[in-house]
């Protein structure tokens, strides 16, 4: 503000600072995820908080189980509304195996490429959602190191539903999913009791993602 109380420069509100991010969500779509509606509800709540556009935040989604599918690329949609519609239509692809390392590696190698809409100089964020220990966990060390080398920030979410339903120990699973998260782990790792509880972490997850850019 000038001495004559004229506005000479306007400052964007804080939430507007956090717009330049390329976010790829890596979803476990293996058979044990149930109900799938909880996953799409989680996506809906998370995505509607985002300012999506070619000059703002971009979102891509990868789904994995035994194999990996690009549901949509970072540059596929140019508004939050379009992404919300597309996310609602994502169907669970299933699979008897949970190849988490492959899902993450495919996201790194393919989803975060310029051909699929990644922008040079824009911070890369990966959100990994899974409900069980991976069959390819012996490949995770390399995959995570590769992500580190490319400065990909990783948020990991462990869904404990199938463990709780089967009265199984979650210790090894939680340890694995924590190892996926960027450091400090406590700011990048979440766990929820079951699929329905995914929506309860949306606010905190959203805040932490956008704190990266701020």
């Amino acid at each position: 503000v000038s001495p004559t109380f004229q506005v000479v420069n306007s400052i964007a509100p804080v939430q507007e600072c956090s717009t330049q991010l390329d976010i790829v969500i890596v979803l476990d779509g293996s058979n044990s995820i149930y109900p799938w509606d909880s996953v799409t509800a989680f996506l809906n709540d998370l995505l509607e908080r985002m300012d999506i556009g070619p000059k703002q935040t971009q979102v891509g989604i990868v789904q994995y189980g035994e194999n990996v599918t690009h549901e949509f690329n970072l540059n596929k949609y140019s508004s939050t509304e379009e992404v919300l519609v597309a996310a609602k239509k994502i169907v669970q692809r299933g699979g008897r195996q949970t190849m988490t390392a492959l899902g993450i590696d495919t996201a790194r190698k393919e989803a975060f490429t310029e051909a699929r809409g990644a922008r040079r100089g824009v911070k890369k964020v990966m959100v990994i959602v899974t409900d069980g220990e991976s069959h390819d966990n012996h490949r995770l060390k390399k995959v995570i190191q590769d992500c580190e080398d490319e400065n990909i920030q990783r948020f990991s979410i462990a869904i404990l539903g199938s463990y709780n339903r089967g009265n199984l120990s979650t210790e090894k699973f939680v340890e694995e999913i924590k190892s996926i998260a960027s450091e400090p782990t406590e700011k990048h790792f979440f766990n929820v009791s079951d699929e329905l509880a995914l929506v309860t972490i949306v606010k905190a997850l959203g805040e932490r993602i956008f704190a990266l850019e701020a």
């Epitope: 035994e66 194999n67 990996v68 195996q97 190849m99 492959l102 069959h135 060390k141 390399k142």
Partner: antibody, heavy 117, light 108 residues
């Protein structure tokens, strides 16, 4: 260009421990994009994965050998090693070290180890 | 563990002919985790293909791979004299990493 070279005794007595070292040249073992593997091949037979190690020291072993195998890494020497305890004649084989990224793309030339008294 | 069965055990062909080698898995293998090697007598194996169908550095384009799930194929379009060797498939998606028993391609 990365090269691997196995070294160690070619003859080991039954019940003793087989010890081999793989020296990596032309690149750093600490570069985190690879696992460092040991594979063996019995005379006239196929290939068997023994295990591998990440530069940080995390190890992964073939369950069929796990109780007898130790793989370690020495980043200061750019080497990784294999120890196989309580050997028998069935452990006579060519032992290879290899670099594993997306498949094993660099191999040592292999060293023959005979278990005999 | 995943068992990989290669067939045939031996393939007798002449230079210039097409070789088709099969690798069958006991359970589904992601194609991203399926590789092929070539091994000549007295030598270490050499990586030919990764991701089931991507050629490794320096591998000629007469080598190609295909397949998914439990059935994978290595094809050598026109056999050169240096191609007579043993070929192994390997999966590394599940631990333990496992190799097929090999297919020997010999001169007819």
């Amino acid at each position: 260009q990365v090269q691997l070279q196995e070294s160690g005794p070619g003859l080991v007595k039954p019940s003793q421990t087989l010890s081999l070292t793989c020296t990596v040249s032309g690149g750093s073992i600490s570069r985190g994009n690879y696992y460092w593997s040991w594979i063996r091949q019995h005379p006239g037979k196929g290939l068997e994965w023994i295990g591998y190690i990440f530069y940080s020291g995390s190890t992964y072993y073939n369950p069929s050998l796990k109780s007898r195998v130790t793989i370690s890494v020495d980043t200061s020497k750019n080497q990784f090693s294999l120890k196989l305890s309580s050997v028998t004649a069935a452990d006579t084989a060519v032992y290879y070290c290899a670099r594993d990224g997306y498949g094993m793309d660099v191999w040592g030339q292999g060293t023959t180890v005979t278990v005999s008294s | 563990e995943i068992v990989l069965t290669q067939s045939p055990g031996t393939l007798s062909l002449s230079p210039g002919e097409r070789a088709t080698l099969s690798c069958r898995a006991s359970q589904s293998v992601s194609s991203s985790y399926l590789v092929w090697y070539q091994q000549k007598p007295g030598q270490a194996p050499r990586l030919l293909l990764y991701d089931a169908s991507s050629r490794a550095t320096g591998i000629p384009d007469r080598f190609s791979g295909s397949g998914s799930g439990t059935d994978f194929t290595l094809t050598i379009s026109r056999l050169e004299p240096e191609d007579f060797a043993v070929y192994y498939c390997q999966q590394y998606g599940n631990s333990p990493l496992t190799f097929g028993g090999g297919t020997k391609v010999e001169i007819k």
